[in-house]
């Protein structure tokens, strides 16, 4: 049992000790204490190195002292003749005597006491890696800021793991670099690049100083690189001992820096970057690579262009070139694609036209496009004949690769209008007589189709409803028939800038510039019941003379109906403007003089009571084209009138052709260009 103090006496003390004796005492004090052993009497046969008789003090495997001879105290106030202080809690005392003694020796008297040891200072090996704190019977270790105490309660380390680097280029250094790195730490860094890049580590010799290896060549502190199943290192010493450029052949690299308790140096700093994987230069017949390079690497893109007369076919699409990308696995994308003799492929279809299926689509073949006659014609010429060219395109001698454009034939009704009986005083009509006729249901009115995307009408029709619902292709506007006709959806309404917008439109006396355009969301498909009317030419041929006949059509008021359900039409002569001025306005909203008459208006009617009326507004006053008798053009638009059944006023469209063309051009879609 450990004790705090004790006494040790040589055999027979204070009498002479016997010969040939060997006696040992095992002293043990409680853990955390040292032993103070002191002798108050010493009288042992003296010999060289105490070879004959001796008292030996042993701590572990170390001999703390070997005593013989006589000693006396140097201090008159202390009886101690010899003393030992050991920082351990165990001590062995061995007394030996040989076979003879020339004199009578009385031996020794010794005492031991347990003393506090300062573990922090009393040992060569410091017990704590950083801060040591002594207390009676023990000690404890503590750490500086940002360090933590390991489970052994002695060593401090830093938490330097967990960083993941994903950038294609970067720099990593040991903690505190270039100040000394922390001891007793394990730092792990991960580099994780996207596939297709290998991590390349670059170091400078002078950027590396890590505690050197021991005599056996083992690194005490070490830097190790692990890439998959490959390891680089461990490395240590002053100046980097490994290759200054490490190609890992992997997109993932783990860096492990392990330090022990001693010998902190400045550490290390490295740079890394992602090196793209290389792809081989391949031989592809009948083609040229662009750009041409000696070496291709990951993410490099080449354009492989076929020679003239060759093409690359992917699925059903032909092209003269394709792109290939160096992939992360070191292989080219699109490697299956090859340059073959040109096949122009199935010719592209065109709106409102067709192309006969060709016998062959290879280089030199000929095809012919036609438009859906008689409703469409080929606008941009070229005759519609195309041949398969070396670049894989169908080419026309005039248009080149540009496709023919089939545009609606204007002003040609499928059936001519014939007056069957005496609108007001008009006749029943069929929509095939007036395929350009558009029906507006709110307000109840008309308009004229002038091409696939545009409807011409009177400004007063749309000024109160900028999102009108329109229909084409039906003789009857009976609801069930309208459901089967084509409804047109407006995209935007353009009212002539010269049309005066009034606070109270009911009191209008000025109908000058009564013209508007409605742009449609979708193109109208032409046919026997739907096709546009032509616009007037700008030449003097299109100047109207008194007596010139024009056709009007609409679903407006008749003698019998407020609103006609079936289309009505009438043939009217152009009249001098004064004839319209002379008619008394049936319901004047102002003095007769207030009503405005301008050269932008055509006066027509007056014959047999035939006239347009309420509900006909916006419809075309159609006149035979002076240069092509098979066609009609919109000379006027139903605008206003003093009295139904007399003369009516029509907007003179010729005066607005420039505005119409400009508005349509500025608001066209790519499909229409």
């Amino acid at each position: 049992e450990p004790t705090m103090y004790g006494e040790i006496l040589s055999p027979n003390y204070p009498q002479a000790y016997p010969s040939e004796v060997e006696k040992s005492w095992d002293i043990e004090v409680p853990e955390g204490y040292g032993i103070h052993l002191y002798f108050t009497h010493l009288d042992i046969e003296l010999s060289e190195n105490c070879a004959y008789d001796s008292v030996q003090i042993i701590s572990g495997d170390t001999e703390e002292g070997r005593l013989c001879g006589q000693r006396s105290s140097n201090n008159p106030h202390s009886p101690i003749v010899e003393e030992f202080q050991v920082p351990y809690n165990k001590l062995q005392v061995i007394f030996k005597s040989d076979f003879s003694n020339e004199e009578r020796f009385t031996g020794f008297a010794a005492y031991y006491v347990a003393t506090d040891i300062n573990e922090c200072t009393d040992f060569v090996d410091v017990p704590c890696s950083h801060f040591c704190n002594n207390f009676i019977g023990g000690y404890f270790c503590s750490c500086p800021p940002e360090y933590f105490l390991h489970d052994d309660m002695k060593n401090c380390g830093v938490n330097c793991s967990g960083d993941v680097f994903t950038a294609l280029i970067g720099e990593i250094a040991s903690p505190n670099y270039p100040k000394p790195y922390p001891e007793n730490s394990r730092c792990e860094y991960q580099i994780r690049l996207e596939k297709g890049f290998q991590v390349v580590v670059t170091l400078r010799r002078e950027d590396f100083d890590v505690e050197a290896a021991d005599s056996a060549g083992n690194c005490l502190d070490s830097l190790v690189f692990v890439a998959g199943d490959r390891q680089f290192g461990p490395y240590c010493g002053h100046g980097f001992p490994g290759p200054l450029n490490i190609e890992t052949k992997s997109n993932a690299l783990d860096i492990i820096f392990q330090t022990d308790l001693t010998g902190q140096k400045k550490g290390w700093k490295l740079r890394y970057h992602g090196d793209p994987m290389p792809c081989p230069k391949e031989d592809t017949p009948n083609s040229v690579w662009e750009p041409a390079k000696a070496k291709y690497v990951f993410r490099d893109v080449v354009q492989i262009t076929c020679l003239d007369g060759f093409e690359v076919v992917e699925g059903r699409v032909g092209a003269t070139s394709f792109y290939s990308t160096c992939q992360s696995n070191g292989k080219w994308s699109n490697s299956k694609l090859k340059c073959q003799p040109v096949d122009c492929g199935i010719p592209e279809s065109i709106e409102n036209g067709k192309v006969e299926d060709p016998e062959s689509t290879l280089f030199g073949s000929v095809i012919r496009y036609t438009c859906e006659e008689p409703y469409y014609y080929m606008e941009n010429g070229g005759g519609g004949e195309y041949h398969c060219a070396g670049n894989g395109s169908w080419v026309n001698e005039v248009l080149g690769p540009e496709l023919p454009k089939c545009v609606p034939v204007c002003g040609v009704p499928r059936e001519p209008f014939e007056e069957k009986q005496r609108i007001i005083g008009g006749s029943d009509a069929d929509i095939k007589n007036f395929p350009w006729q558009v029906f507006f249901d709110n307000p109840w009115a008309g308009g004229a189709l002038i091409n696939e995307y545009w409807v011409l009408t009177a400004a007063h029709v749309v000024e109160g409803n900028r999102e009108p619902t329109m229909y084409v292709g039906s003789t009857s506007v009976q609801t069930s028939r309208l459901a089967k006709s084509k409804m047109l959806t407006p995209e935007h309404v353009f009212i002539h800038p010269g049309w005066k917008l009034l606070e109270v439109p009911e009191g209008r006396t000025n109908f000058d510039n009564d013209i508007a355009l409605v742009r449609l969301k979708d193109p109208v498909k032409m046919g026997p019941t739907v096709s546009p009317i032509c616009l007037p030419g700008t030449s003097s041929d299109y100047n109207l003379m008194d007596g010139d006949l024009g056709l009007i059509s609409g679903w407006g008021r008749t003698e019998k109906r407020d609103r006609a359900v079936r289309l009505k039409a009438a043939r009217l002569p152009v009249a001098p403007l004064r004839k319209c001025k002379e008619v008394k306005v049936e319901k004047p909203t102002a003095d007769a003089e207030a009503y405005v008459f301008t050269p932008n208006m055509i006066c027509a009617g007056g014959e047999k009571g035939m006239d347009s009326c309420k509900g006909d507004s916006g419809g075309a006053f159609a006149v035979q084209d002076p240069n092509d008798k098979t066609k009609f053009y919109a000379a006027g638009l139903v605008s206003w009138g003093p009295q139904c059944g007399t003369y009516g006023l029509y907007t003179r469209v010729k005066n607005y052709v420039d505005w119409i063309m400009k508005t349509m051009q500025e608001n066209s879609t790519p499909r229409e260009d």
Partner: antibody
Framework: EVKLEQSGAELVRPGASVKLSCTAS????????IHWVKQRPEQGLEWIGR????????KYAPKFQDKATMTADTSSNTACLQLNSLTSEDTAVYYC????????????WGQGTLVSVSA | FALMTQSTDYLAVSLGQRATISCKAS??????????MNWYQQKPGQPPKLLIY???NLESGIPTRFSGSGFGTDFTLNIHPVEEEDAATYYC?????????FGGGPKLEIK
């Protein structure tokens, strides 16, 4: 939104006249036609006639030719029905109605005006 | 002028059953291939409400349980299945020629 707002109820002496109004909102009356319909208490509907506010063109049912006069003022977007020489037979609710986008029916009606003829 | 006759003044139909209301014109109300016959529903204190126009066209917003048929002089309004809210007076009206005329308007009661 299309709306027809009619004037308030009228209590009139026999032999007198009364003028009822029908004010439109959400559209211009000159683009439509205004019809007037009579309904006597617990009785059916009778068509009085119609007016085209654009030119005051009117059509009356023969029965109301001398009883009713229809007018329209496009500047105030209002139509009127005047009833004269009133008798107890004229006690009824009078409605105005329009075509809207139809061509011979009434999707839109006023709320009606009650005319009571009593001594 | 065209006289409109609705044969009954009163009609009682069980909930969920079919109500058939007929209307006969004294002369054809057809013109240009269209029948100028319309149907209205009226509830006490309210103006009439358009249900069917041009003989068979359902006005927007009207439930599909209402349907109209006929041409010339004979026309029918069908309601199937009848619901509680359908209790009202139903008028036919011709608009083919002046003066426009209405039928007497039978009252529909839901049993």
């Amino acid at each position: 939104e299309v709306k027809l707002e009619q004037s308030g109820a009228e209590l009139v002496r026999p032999g007198a006249s009364v003028k009822l109004s029908c004010t439109a909102s959400g559209f211009n009356i000159k683009d439509d036609y205004i019809h007037w319909v009579k309904q006597r208490p617990e009785q059916g509907l009778e068509w009085i006639g119609r007016i085209d506010p654009a030119d005051d063109h009117t059509k009356y049912a023969p029965k109301f030719q001398d009883k009713a006069t229809m007018t329209a003022d496009t500047s105030s977007n209002t139509a009127c029905l005047q009833l004269n020489s009133l008798t107890s037979e004229d006690t009824a609710v009078y409605y105005c109605a329009i075509y809207g986008s139809g061509w011979a029916w009434f999707p839109y009606w006023g709320q009606g005006t009650l005319v009571s003829v009593s001594a | 002028f065209a006289l409109m006759t609705q044969s009954t003044d009163y009609l009682a139909v069980s909930l969920g059953q079919r109500a058939t209301i007929s209307c006969k014109a004294s002369q054809s109300v057809d013109y240009d291939g269209d029948s100028y016959m319309n149907w209205y529903q009226q509830k006490p204190g309210q103006p009439p409400k358009l249900l069917i126009y041009a003989a068979s066209n359902l006005e927007s917003g009207i439930p599909t349980r209402f349907s109209g048929s006929g041409f010339g002089t004979d026309f029918t309004l069908n309601i199937h299945p009848v619901e509680e809210e359908d209790a009202a007076t139903y008028y036919c009206q011709q608009s083919n020629e002046d003066p426009w005329t209405f039928g007497g308007g039978p009252k529909l009661e839901i049993k």
